[in-house]
């Protein structure tokens, strides 16, 4: 027999959690005239949903409650003066990782 | 030294994958006259993103490539016909689970 209370607890614990998302480094760093290799990296970002939120609010959202910066070594390619050749350099880029997530009320509709 | 090709492969493999999502059973089954306990269940659905899609298209989306139906035992509460009170019964509900996911082109803009 299934423990229905356990199912409810499972939903609460695992529906809104840090997950793998690929982010475009160029977009993340707003560095439009630089190409990075790889162009995307895996980061942990809050994901999933709060479909059955325990808060008393109209709309619940899954947000980070603990954020850290992590450094990733990537190859950076930038145009030189002219039409041929690129500056190539290894560089460390800092990207936000979400370590913990929470279901919270969107806006100020009580909680 | 970081293997940059390995990072690219990691992004490809893990950015668009089956993840835990909580779904409202009533909404999923379109059964507005019935209350289920628990109201939500965890299912595997394709999530993440395709930020650095390998396809030649303007917009790439993360979609299921293998879908299965799984049965979940829940408590179902329905109004009795013509009298006060609720029918209580344990029932199996079938929910879609995504087992494999793929990044594909949205619309028909090449591949």
């Amino acid at each position: 027999v299934v423990d229905l209370n356990l199912l409810t607890e499972e939903v609460r614990l695992y529906s809104c959690t840090p997950r793998n998302f690929s982010v475009s480094i160029r977009e993340e760093l707003k560095r439009t005239d630089t190409i990075f290799w790889p162009g995307c990296l895996l980061v942990k970002r809050c994901g999933g949903n709060c479909a059955c939120c325990l808060h008393n609010c109209n709309e619940c959202q899954c947000v980070p409650s603990k954020v850290t910066k992590k450094y990733h070594e990537v190859l950076q390619l930038r145009p030189k003066t002219g039409v041929r050749g690129l500056h190539k350099s290894l560089t460390d880029v800092a990207l936000e990782h979400h370590e913990e997530c929470d279901c919270v009320c969107r806006g100020s509709t009580g909680g | 030294v970081v293997d940059l090709n390995l990072l690219t492969e990691e992004v490809r493999l893990y950015s668009c994958t089956p993840r835990n999502f909580s779904v409202s059973i009533r909404e999923e089954l379109k059964r507005t006259d019935t209350i289920f306990w628990p109201g939500c269940l965890l299912v595997k659905r394709c999530g993440g993103n395709c930020a650095c899609c390998l396809h030649n298209c303007n917009e790439c989306q993360c979609v299921p490539s293998k879908v299965t139906k799984k049965y979940h035992e829940v408590l179902q509460l329905r109004p009795k016909t013509g009298v006060r009170g609720l029918h209580k019964s344990l029932t199996d509900v079938a929910l879609e689970h995504h087992e494999e996911c793929d990044c594909v082109c949205r619309g028909s803009t090449g591949g």
């Epitope: 160029r26 560095r31 439009t32 005239d33 630089t34 190409i35 162009g39 390619l77 930038r78 145009p79 030189k80 003066t81 002219g82 039409v83 041929r84 050749g85 690129l86 | 030649n56 303007n58 090449g110």
Partner: antibody, heavy 119, light 112 residues
Framework: EVQLLESGGGLVQPGGSLRLSCAAS????????MSWVRQTPGKGLEWVAT????????YYPDSMKGRFTISRDNAKNTLYLQMNSLRAEDTAVYYC????????????WGQGTLLTVSS | DVVMTQSPLSLPVTLGQPASISCRSS???????????LEWYLQKPGQSPRLLIY???NRFSGVPDRFSGSGSGTDFTLKISRVEAEDVGVYYC?????????FGQGTKLEIK
Amino acid sequence: EVQLLESGGGLVQPGGSLRLSCAASGFTFSSYGMSWVRQTPGKGLEWVATIGYGGSFTYYPDSMKGRFTISRDNAKNTLYLQMNSLRAEDTAVYYCARQAPLWDYFDYWGQGTLLTVSS
Amino acid sequence: DVVMTQSPLSLPVTLGQPASISCRSSQTIVHSDGTTYLEWYLQKPGQSPRLLIYKVSNRFSGVPDRFSGSGSGTDFTLKISRVEAEDVGVYYCFQGSHVPPTFGQGTKLEIK
């Protein structure tokens, strides 16, 4: 399939202005540098301008600096060439060309659009 | 500016025979990154130019292996081992190592 389609050419009087467009499809436009190259009966092929992936890097030959401006709209997958103070010697077929990923060569060219500067 | 001089300007060739086009630069065309950015483009009648060879000797994808590039310093050559009817057009060399980048004046290949 990579496609580059130029438009906006036509007849302009000396001293006039014109904007050429190049619509790109079949590739991730924002990940490529782009260039304009023109072809005149007298001078043959001549490089006109180059722009980086995001638009903040631009480069021109001295002879066209100040008169010509290259720009791009990555949301619209379109490259532009704004030409001011046009002269008879600017009469040419204007091609847009894609820079290879590592800026090693022009790997794809459009079909060209003809600009005629004449009174 | 670096001047690129091609010869001959006109090249009549018999089908199936080899052809050779020379391109000389007014100064050495080695980029600051050590690469020689010398390219060859073919413009067929009524079409836009298309890439044949890049960085002196690298064939672009889809280009038949009868086309080959060679050279260094200031002297470069494009060779066609056996000319076919579809090879007709104007061949241009191009240097991108120095600014501004410049094209040769073109060599018109025609069938005898």
